[in-house]
């Protein structure tokens, strides 16, 4: 084993190195000292370190470690943050276009239903946006609401346009009749299925990306323990105390220290792997009714078909509703 | 046949969209993200090694520091001696993760559970047969693409993609311009949505 080179007789080199960390030289001994008060850089002979220097080294070592960790995760963090923002914006654009297609369908095919239809369509797509962003809305309620609101307008404007204004009080009865008589056939149920499946997947996709950011942020800002600080100080700075300024830590030794310092962080590994693989599986399944773009941009057409379904059965429905709601109207005025 | 929403309240002059060589869809964007994420699948297990390789470590030198003394790089002491009688490394590992790490692991477990629940096998079908009442027209079978478009002559197929263009093409908003409707017929009888969302590399 080669003998260690003799320590710097004046601690001059150590002083100039330490000055970069801590301007003000009062903590560096002029000449090597026994260093009996040292707790980390335990000397085998005279040392150029003091207790204060050791504390400063520990602080610096932990800061270095935090910076290294942050630079290690920078690319990954940027990737997820950027994509989370891009997808959120993209989904918002899809919702906005879907709303416009639906409004355009009403304007072109059923001008008499606007502007009420615009209002109901706007509220429906606002709910869609809120749902995607994590609000606790029930999709079936959203769809029911859309059809509940549309039917009274369809009935009074399209099916029975001759109704006097006083008859508008039957709106509540019409809302009830909409469900009881299944006036839109199975279209509401179809839309519920498609919308709920596609939005659930979209929402969880965004949630997963946002959690990815949270995971990186958490490990990015970890505060390392005192034990870890001591290990890092010993590895990176204790050689300075012996005047060995240019010497570097052994590779195997560094790995052992890092594994010790990062034992807790590395426990995330198993769940992180599973996260990426599960996200991949989800993405592979985002097609057809599990693809909100496909579903929402086609909604205008399904809604159009549902109104055509009502119109096709208008004769039968008008008779039934005439009886049903005339009675409820009388009851209200009693 | 129905008059479908080709009238999308667009100013015609905005529709002059340059030919796009590379058409990027939302689904291709998702797959691209997954491929990039997969290159980080070993991120946490590789962290100790990454940090060592990005901090000063003896690579070509004959001698290196083992925490206590200068040793030859390939000797047994290179990894071991520095840890002796200093403190118990095993003890440090046994302490377990910090509370914040435990919390984030719990959140990961939860999202993984949700992701697995949502990721059903390929060829998924609707939970119930949706034509149990029997539609008279525009019937829908289970999980048919045609369902999401209905029926009718001259039906406009909705193109299943959000294109990412180098230039902002158009942004539709009925709320903003209910009055100025312009006739605009999407190419090939398709409705496509366009928006500029810069590439992430």
């Amino acid at each position: 084993q080669p003998p260690p080179p003799p320590p710097d007789a004046t601690c001059h080199q150590v002083r100039s190195f330490f000055q970069r960390l801590q301007p003000g030289l009062k903590w560096v001994p002029e000449t090597p000292v026994p260093g009996s008060d040292l707790q980390v850089c335990l000397p085998k002979g005279p040392t150029c370190c003091s207790r204060k220097m050791e504390e400063k080294y520990q602080l610096t070592a932990r800061l270095n470690m935090e910076q290294l960790l942050q630079s290690a995760s920078m690319e990954l963090k940027f990737l997820i943050i950027q994509n989370a923002a891009v997808f959120q914006e993209a989904f918002e654009i899809v919702v906005r276009h879907a709303k416009n297609y639906t409004n355009a369908m009403f304007k072109n095919n059923y001008p008499s239903l606007t502007p009420q239809a615009f209002e109901f369509v706007g509220e429906f797509f606002t709910d869609v946006s809120l749902y995607i962003l994590g609000s606790d809305i029930n999709v079936d309620d959203m769809v029911n609401e859309l059809f509940d609101s549309l039917f009274p307008v369809i009935y009074t404007q399209l099916m029975n346009p001759g109704l006097p204004d006083s008859a508008l009080d039957i709106n509540e009865c019409l809302r009830g009749a909409r469900r009881d008589l299944k006036v839109f056939g199975n279209f509401p149920k179809l839309i519920m299925t498609q919308v709920s499946k596609s939005l659930q997947v979209t929402r969880i996709f965004l949630q997963a990306l946002n959690l990815g950011i949270e995971v990186i942020n958490t490990t990015d800002h970890l505060k390392f323990s005192k034990d870890c600080g001591r290990m890092l100080t010993r590895m990176w700075y204790c050689s300075y105390c012996q005047g060995l300024m240019m010497v570097k830590p052994c590779g195997g030794y560094c790995n052992v220290v890092m594994q010790g310092c990062m034992a807790g962080v590395v426990e995330i590994d198993k769940y992180w792997r599973e996260y990426i693989l599960s996200l991949e599986e989800l993405v592979n399944g985002m097609y057809r009714i599990y693809d909100m773009e496909n579903v929402l941009l086609g909604l205008f057409s399904t809604i159009h078909d549902s109104i055509q379904y009502v119109q096709k059965n208008a004769g039968k429905l008008t008779t039934t509703i005439g009886k049903l709601c005339a009675h409820s109207q009388q009851r209200q005025y009693r | 046949s129905a008059y479908y929403p080709e009238d999308l309240f667009i100013d015609k002059k905005v529709l002059k969209v340059a030919h796009v060589e590379h058409e990027e869809t939302l689904s291709s964007r998702r797959r691209e993200l997954i491929q990039k994420l997969k290159s980080f699948i070993s991120f946490y297990s590789a962290l100790p090694g990454y940090i060592c390789s990005h901090s000063p470590v003896a690579e070509n030198d004959t001698l290196c520091w083992n925490g206590q003394e200068l040793v030859e790089r390939y000797s047994q002491k290179a990894a071991r001696n520095g840890m002796k009688n200093q403190f118990n490394l095993h003890e440090l590992k046994m302490k377990g993760p910090e509370p914040v790490v435990s919390q984030i692991i719990d959140k990961l477990k939860h999202i993984n559970q949700l992701l697995r629940t949502m990721s059903m096998p390929k060829g998924r079908v609707l939970d119930k047969n949706l034509d149990e009442e029997g539609f008279e027209s525009g019937d829908c079978g289970d999980d048919e693409d045609e369902c999401i478009g209905g029926s009718g002559d001259g039906m406009i197929k909705v193109k299943n993609q959000l294109r990412f263009l180098a230039e902002l093409a158009y942004d539709l908003d009925v709320d903003d311009a209910p009055g100025n409707s312009q006739q605009a017929t999407p190419k090939d009888n398709e409705i496509s949505t366009f928006h500029n969302l810069g590439n992430v590399h």
Epitope: L130, D136, I137, D140, D141, N144, D148, Q332 | -
Partner: antibody, heavy 121, light 111 residues
């Protein structure tokens, strides 16, 4: 016409319970979200709780979460508010309100006349 | 959830205009969420004046109008009348779908 009628208010000691009811008529009850809103004497309106039309989703203000429970019986057209562990600061007129919408809170287009709850020893 | 911010009072002479502001945050007024306005006379239940930021229910005079921009909303009363003297509340909901009210503004019609 559309009407809401609250009942069940009164004087109650701190820590005790009370159940408010709201009978609805003149509209399709199950199609709309319903709310409880309160107003302490001389103060502004404070939202307490909401329930969606189907009853599947419930929402609470932080000040009552864990103590109050909202529920509805669509077959009886009735809304309820079960108030447990009552405190002096819960003293207020409690209004039952119908939402314009069914899926969640939006705007309250019909209000009851209110029932006074006084929590005092 | 914190309340929306309204001025405590506003006043004007008959025939004049009064505007009441209502400020929230990006998670309530500033989000996708709609703002509503209510009028309340002492000892009475509130009455809906505006919903969906700017829509008037039937029966509400067109002297009342609402608007929303960013994280603020406002209620304008033009051609002020004696019966407009009342308390006015704005209301929205946050991203958790919990309702938030403003603190209320007392409108006084002078003279």
């Amino acid at each position: 016409q559309v009407q809401l009628q609250e009942s069940g208010g009164g004087l109650v000691q701190p820590g005790r319970s009370l159940r408010l009811s709201c009978a609805a008529s003149g509209f399709t009850f199950s199609s709309y979200a319903m709310h409880w809103v309160r107003q302490a004497p001389g103060k502004g309106l404070e939202w307490v709780s909401a329930i969606s039309g189907s009853g599947g989703s419930t929402y609470y203000a932080d000040s009552v979460k864990g103590r109050f429970t909202i529920s509805r019986d669509n077959s009886k057209n009735t809304l309820y508010l079960q108030m447990n562990s009552l405190r002096a600061e819960d003293t207020a007129v409690y209004y039952c309100a119908k939402d314009r919408r069914g899926s969640h809170a939006d705007a309250f287009d019909v209000w009851g006349q209110g029932t006074l709850v006084t929590v005092s020893s | 959830q914190s309340a929306l911010t309204q001025p405590p009072s506003a006043s004007g002479s008959p025939g004049q205009s009064v505007t009441i502001s209502c400020t929230g945050t990006s998670s309530d007024v500033g989000g996708y969420n709609y703002v509503s306005w209510y009028q309340q006379y002492p000892g009475k239940a509130p009455k809906l004046l505006i919903y969906g930021n700017s829509n008037r229910p039937s029966g509400v005079p067109d002297r009342f109008s609402g608007s929303k921009s960013g994280t603020s909303a406002s209620l304008a009363i033009t051609g002020l009348q004696a019966e407009d003297g009342a308390d006015y509340y704005c209301q929205s909901y946050d991203s958790s779908l919990r309702v938030v009210f403003g603190g209320g503004t007392k409108v006084t019609v002078l003279g």
